[in-house]
């Protein structure tokens, strides 16, 4: 579809500021009108964009999910960032929730990393240093964590 | 993952109408801007109109305006395309694609899902 094919049908609240695109695209903060003559701004706390683009609507913000806090509101140029609650963390390979961080390692291994809102606590074999990942078993001597508290920010969108 | 699940494609009559349904199972798509495309035989995908996260902006191919209304309803997780005054040149397969946003000109923007296609032919 070429880019003529393309007409006005844009409808944009009222207080929406408009300007013109730069080389057919629009700033961050704005998405292009569908005849693309106009940037349209994006409506704050609502959506956002983040780069210079040609986009037809802006992305909607995301909401930061129960156990989680949010460490920055969404503006028309930034998502929400969202962290995982004290005591839990978020995987890279199931970023769509918090888990609880273990409280303790198993028998024969020393905590060497605190419990963060992006990992887990982190167990070593006491003798050979080996990290060790995956379910704690039935703890026996645990090493309890405090968790820990520096932010990191994890933003999803979506 | 999101799945897209379409119906309500057939066989009509040019001047007729038709409503297409497209559902989303697996996760919600309230938080995707909604789109619709469709292909003939050795064309390229074409799009064919698009609706915000929220339902409150909509962009359409030229060829449809005036004709056709997408529309979505995020309780029930679905989006509509209703096409009236249909032509013969509507026959298409068309799909429904979910995605961040699109772009000017039709192309999905970041995270996109597509659905498995349904089939209008619009006859003489």
């Known amino acids: 579809i070429t880019q003529q094919d393309l007409a006005p049908q844009q409808r944009a609240a009222p207080q929406q500021k408009r300007s013109s695109p730069s080389e057919g695209l629009c700033p961050p903060g704005h998405h292009i009108s569908e005849d693309g003559r106009d940037c349209i701004s994006c409506k704050y706390g609502q959506d956002y964009s983040t780069h210079w683009n040609d986009l037809l609507f802006c992305l909607r913000c995301t909401r930061c999910d129960s156990g989680e806090v949010e460490l920055s509101p969404c503006t028309t140029t930034r998502n929400t960032v969202c962290q995982c609650e004290e005591g839990t963390f978020r995987e890279e390979d199931s970023p769509e929730m918090c888990r609880k961080c273990r409280t303790g390692c198993p028998r024969g291994m020393v905590k060497v990393g605190d419990c963060t809102p992006w990992s887990d606590i982190e167990c070593v074999h006491k003798e050979s240093g080996t990290k060790h990942s995956g379910e704690v078993p039935a703890v026996e001597e645990t090493v309890t964590s405090s968790p820990g508290t520096p932010a990191s920010p994890c933003s999803l969108s979506g | 993952q999101v799945q897209l699940v379409q119906s309500g494609g057939g066989l009509v009559q040019a001047g007729g109408s038709l409503r297409l349904t497209c559902t989303a199972s697996?996760?919600?798509?309230?938080?995707?801007?909604m789109g619709w495309f469709r292909q003939t035989p050795g064309k390229d995908r074409e799009f064919v109109a698009a609706l915000n996260w929220s339902g409150d902006t909509t962009s359409y191919a030229d060829s449809v305006r005036g004709r056709f209304t997408i529309s979505r309803d995020n309780t029930r997780n679905t989006v509509y395309l209703q096409m009236d005054s249909l032509k013969r040149e509507d026959t298409a397969v068309y799909y429904c694609?979910?995605?961040?946003?699109?772009?000017?000109?039709?192309?999905?923007?970041?995270?996109?899902?597509w659905g498995q296609g349904t089939q209008v032919t619009v006859s003489s």
């Open positions: 697996g996760r919600t798509v309230s938080n995707y801007a």
């Open positions: 694609a979910a995605a961040q946003s699109f772009r000017r000109g039709g192309a999905p923007y970041g995270d996109n899902y």
